[in-house]
Amino acid sequence: CKAMHVAQPAVVLASSRGIASFVCEYASPGKATEVRVTVLRQADSQVTEVCAATYMMGNELTFLDDSICTGTSSGNQVNLTIQGLRAMDTGLYICKVELMYPPPYYLGIGNGTQIYVIDPEPCPDSDF
């Protein structure tokens, strides 16, 4: 039974607007038509789910309307964007990929992307 490797960047810096983007790439052992991608955040050994999407190969990822994640897929690559990040959201963001259909089922977990978020300095008061 083959393993499924999932690759993601080691470190990403969020923009000053609190947006971080990274690619989650998986080496598919089979011809999956239905894929589920989950992003989890690990900080201080606590793990929480950030967002998840199931998509059909060739179609767009669809996250829930209130999700902080958006994404696009291209082949075995998923381009993920997380918005609304603040300094307290710094942590290890883990990409988990599941090949749901057709059987056999495969699961792969990336090494995680350490996302650093720095809150912007407040603008100084101005007379103008």
């Epitope: 490797h5 793990v47 789910e49 883990i94 977990i109 990336g110």
Partner: nanobody
Framework: EVQLVESGGGLIQPGGSLRLSCAAS????????MGWYRQAPGQGRDLVSH???????MYADSAKGRFTISRDNAKKTLYLQMNSLRPEDTAVYYC?????????WGQGTLVTVSS
């Protein structure tokens, strides 16, 4: 190096119950997924169930209602309670562990359901 050791297999009559265990040793990432696969004679390995360290559980259709997966994170041990066993449940049951960037298999434990 991570090692997985399964136990609890054996010969059981139809309708009976078994509890499989899988003990992990070595360094494991705090987020991980542990699961059970089974391989019937002449077949491929099929997922039975898995459970993540944060409690998320998935069951294959064949396991729903009769099998219950659980884990003890402190002991790094995975369990599979199998009830109402049928002859078609006869297989080698393998433990699998997914950690960040890697996965591992146990050697398997044989479950035979026969009268």
């Amino acid at each position: 190096e991570v090692q997985l050791v399964e136990s609890g297999g054996g010969l059981i009559q139809p309708g009976g119950s078994l509890r499989l265990s899988c003990a992990a040793s070595g360094s494991i990432s705090s987020y991980n997924v542990m699961g059970w696969y089974r391989q019937a004679p002449g077949q491929g390995r099929d997922l039975v169930s898995h459970i993540a360290s944060n409690g998320e559980i998935m069951y294959a259709d064949s396991a729903k209602g009769r099998f219950t997966i659980s884990r003890d994170n402190a002991k790094k041990t995975l369990y599979l309670q199998m009830n109402s066993l049928r002859p078609e449940d006869t297989a080698v049951y393998y433990c699998k562990l997914w950690v960040l960037g890697n996965d591992y298999w146990g050697q398997g434990t044989l479950v035979t359901v026969s009268s």
